[in-house]
């Protein structure tokens, strides 16, 4: 591919006050946005969409609604109890013509294990997806359907970053024209063949993902076929040539020293905002050591934090991060020993990440406890282990079979964990709730195209 190729999808990312409340600071929210965009950028760049390569993403603009915006009447996401369809519609009611896609990140517990929602692109004749411009719909409202939303909460628990990154890639996959995977070729995780099954399902699988199987962050051939057709037809409408950093998007990029956003967003005494003249914008102000936009080890007074200050909390699998006194970056944390218990004793640490099942601590593999006739569904939210590649030995951690490892103690999956072979998620009552993956979008389509079915939100 030549550098002049239009291969970059520019994003507008908004976060609501609940997302801010969970992460606590603008810098932490921006770090989340950055890691999500980097994750999908890596996935899409490493996928060959039938000859279309190096598809990348860039944040063009962000808007962070803080807890101070909770009562702001101009903030459409201020309402506390909104269903997922309405939440997506609130995003779609804004004009997003300047962007390839516009997303809102939230920390809401939507019904039925829904982690995201997005309009599906098509090569022709359909509304929705990448590059879609704002237009009037039959409910009398102008909408931009180049939109999606994701949440980081599921059944009261926060999903691991790798799952949230895959959720984002999945919803963007819808925007790019991929429906959910179906058929044996594209849902190997449902296969009876153990060799195929162990690699898991692909990004566009309709139900649950753990994020740690080989296929989980890859597109299936079904998705690639669909996405290729949409890219072929639509990317020239709004994709741009890659390469230029965007001063004002809140992320420090090549060619910038800092980035505190535009003048209306910049609360930073250290950095020239994006409305300043060319030679100054996104540069450190004279005499300033750093800017908080560079990382959490810079004070509001533009000096590096001292060597002993904490910049990252201790987690299950990594020790706390401590500033080193010479950079705004929070240095990488030392990992805790491999096979340390994590996620409330349901998993173990591997290389500083809570990644493996507790079963692995004892040389076993995690499995789904379920009889084919569904009689044992009370065990679907137990952690169950089996001998490697021997499903006939699959039993709950509370069973006699594994009592030498677990002393008869039943370990239950955390709420929001995938269950029943990735068909659903565990709720707070330890019931495995199946995911209705296509319901919300179907309801929203009905609402937009036959508005009398829609109940308006009351403040």
């Amino acid at each position: 591919t030549t550098s002049a190729e239009k291969n970059t999808c520019q994003l507008y990312i908004q976060t609501d006050h609940l997302f801010f409340k969970y992460y606590g600071t603008r810098e932490a929210v921006i770090a989340q946005i950055s890691s999500h965009v980097k994750a999908i950028d890596t996935i899409y760049q490493t996928t060959d969409f039938s000859g279309i390569r190096n598809i990348s993403f860039m944040v063009k603009r962000i808007r962070i609604n803080t807890t101070a915006d909770e009562k702001d009447p101009t903030n459409p996401f201020r309402f506390p109890n909104i269903g997922v369809e309405k939440f997506l519609e609130l995003n779609s009611e804004q004009n997003h013509d300047d962007y390839c896609l516009a997303y809102v990140f939230t920390d809401r517990d939507f019904d039925d294990g829904v982690l995201g929602l997005a309009w599906v692109g098509a090569p022709s004749g359909s509304s929705g997806g990448i590059c879609e411009k704002s237009k009037l719909y039959s409910d009398g409202k102008k909408k931009s359907l180049n939109t999606g939303i994701i949440t980081v909460q599921n059944y009261g628990s926060h999903v691991p970053p790798k799952v949230s990154h895959i959720t984002f890639a999945h919803e963007v996959g819808h925007n790019f024209g991929s429906p959910h995977d179906s058929g044996t070729e594209c849902t190997p995780g449902e296969s009876k063949n153990l060799g195929q099954k162990e690699n898991g399902n692909y990004i566009m699988y309709a139900r649950a993902t753990s994020g740690d199987k080989l296929n989980n962050n890859k597109f299936s051939l079904c998705s690639i076929r669909n996405i290729s057709q949409v890219l072929e037809k639509k990317r020239n409408n709004c994709f741009v040539e890659s390469g230029q950093p965007i001063c004002g998007n809140g992320m420090v990029e090549q060619g910038e020293e800092c980035d505190c956003g535009y003048s209306d967003q910049c609360k930073d005494e250290c950095c020239f905002d994006a409305n300043q003249p060319e030679g100054r914008k996104c540069k450190l102000k004279p005499g300033k050591q750093c800017s908080p936009s560079q990382g959490p080890c810079c004070t509001a007074q533009c000096a590096f934090k001292s060597k002993s200050e904490k910049c990252r909390d201790d987690s299950d699998c990594a020790r706390e991060g401590i500033c080193n006194g010479f950079t705004a970056l929070c240095p990488a944390s030392d990992p805790k020993p491999n096979f340390t218990d994590c996620n409330r004793h349901t998993q173990v640490c591997i290389n500083g990440q809570c990644a493996g099942s507790i079963c692995e601590k004892y040389g076993l593999e995690e499995c789904t406890c379920a009889s084919s006739d569904g009689k044992d569904d009370k065990e679907l939210c137990h952690v169950c282990c089996m001998k490697k590649m021997d499903p006939s030995t699959c039993a709950s951690t509370g069973s006699v079979q594994w009592s030498r490892h677990f002393s008869g103690r039943t370990i239950t999956l955390q709420p929001g964990s995938p269950c029943n072979d990735f068909r659903g998620y565990c709720d707070v009552f330890m019931r495995c709730r199946l995911v209705d993956a296509d319901g919300p979008l179907a309801r929203l389509k009905k609402a937009i195209f036959s508005p009398e079915l829609y109940e308006n939100i009351a403040e």
Epitope: S34, T42, Q45, S56, E253, E256, E257, C282, C290
Partner: nanobody
């Protein structure tokens, strides 16, 4: 999956120079933050240099002797080490946020 691969280490006399490079298997764009860490024998892994956008920062122990730079075309990062001292001995790792550690490259400075 993106993996980091460090190279350029070796055995060098005190006062000598080395240039470490960090390449990647797998594509990743928009790499705006990169850093180099050193793990001396029996010690923890400590950052020695970082590049954030176009801003560079150095640990006091290497300031004026080490230079971190980015190859924008290759989206890679290198560390030029001059006037090396025996206390610079250790395994050097490059780091990109969200990407797993590589194997590192051994630097040994003899007196």
């Amino acid at each position: 999956e993106v993996q980091l691969v460090e190279s350029g280490g070796g055995l060098v006399q005190a006062g000598g120079s080395l240039r470490l490079s960090c390449g990647r298997s797998g594509r990743i764009s928009n790499i705006n933050i990169m850093s180099w860490y050193r793990q001396a024998p029996g010690k923890t892994r400590d950052m020695v240099a970082a590049i954030i956008g176009d801003a560079t920062n150095y640990a006091d122990s290497v300031k004026g002797r080490f230079t971190i730079s980015r190859d924008n075309a290759k989206n890679a990062v290198s560390l030029h080490m001059n006037r090396l001292k025996p206390e610079d001995t250790g395994v050097y790792y490059c780091k990109i946020p969200g990407v797993d550690w590589g194997q590192g490259t051994q630097v040994t400075v003899s007196s």
